[in-house]
Interface confidence: low
Amino acid sequence: RKIPKVGHTFFQKPESCPPVPGGSMKLDIGIINENQRVSMSRNIESRSTSPWNYTVTWDPNRYPSEVVQAQCRNLGCINAQGKEDISMNSVPIQQETLVVRRKHQGCSVSFQLEKVLVTVGCTCVTPVIHHVQ
Amino acid sequence: GITIPRNPGCPNSEDKNFPRTVMVNLNIHNRNTNTNPKRSSDYYNRSTSPWNLHRNEDPERYPSVIWEAKCRHLGCINADGNVDYHMNSVPIQQEILVLRREPPHCPNSFRLEKILVSVGCTCVTPIVHHVA
C-alpha cells in the first residue's frame, strides 16, 4: 500500500514559498483556531442511548500530547426504561486526525506526520444478523 | 523522517516542548487510509439517529476531502421505523487537526489548523427548554 504524500504537483508554486529540502515539508505547529472552545449538546455522552466514557491518552513525543478517546459503555443500547436492550448495538464512531510524532535517533530528532484514528462517541444501530446456513 | 541535530549538550537537553516550526517528511505514517466513511461502515444508515454524509473539499487543506455528517431527523427512529420526537438526534462533533497551505498555494509549506467536524449522530434524551 502506498503511503499518501501531502504535496500536490498541480499547485503553482508562488515566488513567496519558503525553500524546503527535498522529500520534506515545513510545518508551523502554531495551530490556527487553537483557542476555539467547543461544547457539544450538554452531557451528550451520558444522555445518549449509546452512552460512552472518555479516556485521555498522553504521549510527550506526540503533538498534541493529549488525545481523548471515547469508549462505548454498553454492548446494547439504553431503552426508555433505562435498561440495556441487547437487541440493539452501541457502536463507536471514529474520525481520523493528524498528529506530529517526534522520534529520537541518538542525538538527533526527527518529526513525522501521523494519522491517528480517534473514537469520538457512540451511536445505537440495528444489528446485522448473520444467518448461519 | 528528516533528522535535526540537537544541542551540543544532547544527553541533558531533552526539550519537552515542540518547536514552533518543524521539518517533517512528506510521507504520512498511518494505518488507516480509508477516508470515505461510506465505505468504512453503514452505521449512518443503520443508526437510530441516521445521518447523511456531505463532501467538503478544499485544495488548500490536507486532507483535501472531509466528510461532514448531518442528522437526518430532529427525532430518533423507534422500533417501528418511525421518527420519535420525544428523543433528539444530535451530531457528535470532534476537533481534528488538518494541514493548511501557508503561504497559500505553496506545495510543501503548511500550518496545523484545528477544525470542527460532525462525525456522526447519536440519539439523546432531549434537554427541554421551557418557555417562561
Epitope: 449538546s41 | 462533533q93 432531549p126
Partner: nanobody
Framework: EVQLVESGGGLVQPGGSLRLSCAAS????????MGWYRQAPGKQRELVAL???????DYADSVKGRFTISRDNSKNTVYLQMNSLRPEDTAVYYC??????????????????WGQGTLVTVSS
Amino acid sequence: EVQLVESGGGLVQPGGSLRLSCAASGTIVNIHVMGWYRQAPGKQRELVALIFSGGSADYADSVKGRFTISRDNSKNTVYLQMNSLRPEDTAVYYCAAEIGYYSGGTYYSSEAHWGQGTLVTVSS
C-alpha cells in the same frame, strides 16, 4: 442564546391558504435542521415538515402535496406554505430548529430549540 419567532397564523376557511414564517436569531453559527410541528387540542405534538441544511425536505404524509417548506439561509428563516387547508389542520404550529451557536464564549454544536407557537384555525 437563540430565539425562534413564528408569525403568519390565523383563521382561514377550508380550502384556503396561509404562509407561516419562523426567524431564528442569536449568536447562531449553523442551523442543521429547521421545521414545523403542530399540536391539536388533546393530541401529541407531531411533525409537519423539516428542511435540512443541504436543502432536502421531509413531510408528514398528511400534508404531502399540500404544504411546502422552504428556507432562506441568509435570514435564518424557514417558511411553511400551507395550501388546501382542512379543518383537521387546526392546531398550534411550532417552529423547531437544531442549531449550533455561541454562548458565553463556548460553542454549542447542537441544541433543539422551539418557538412559542402560532395558532392556525381552519373553519368555515
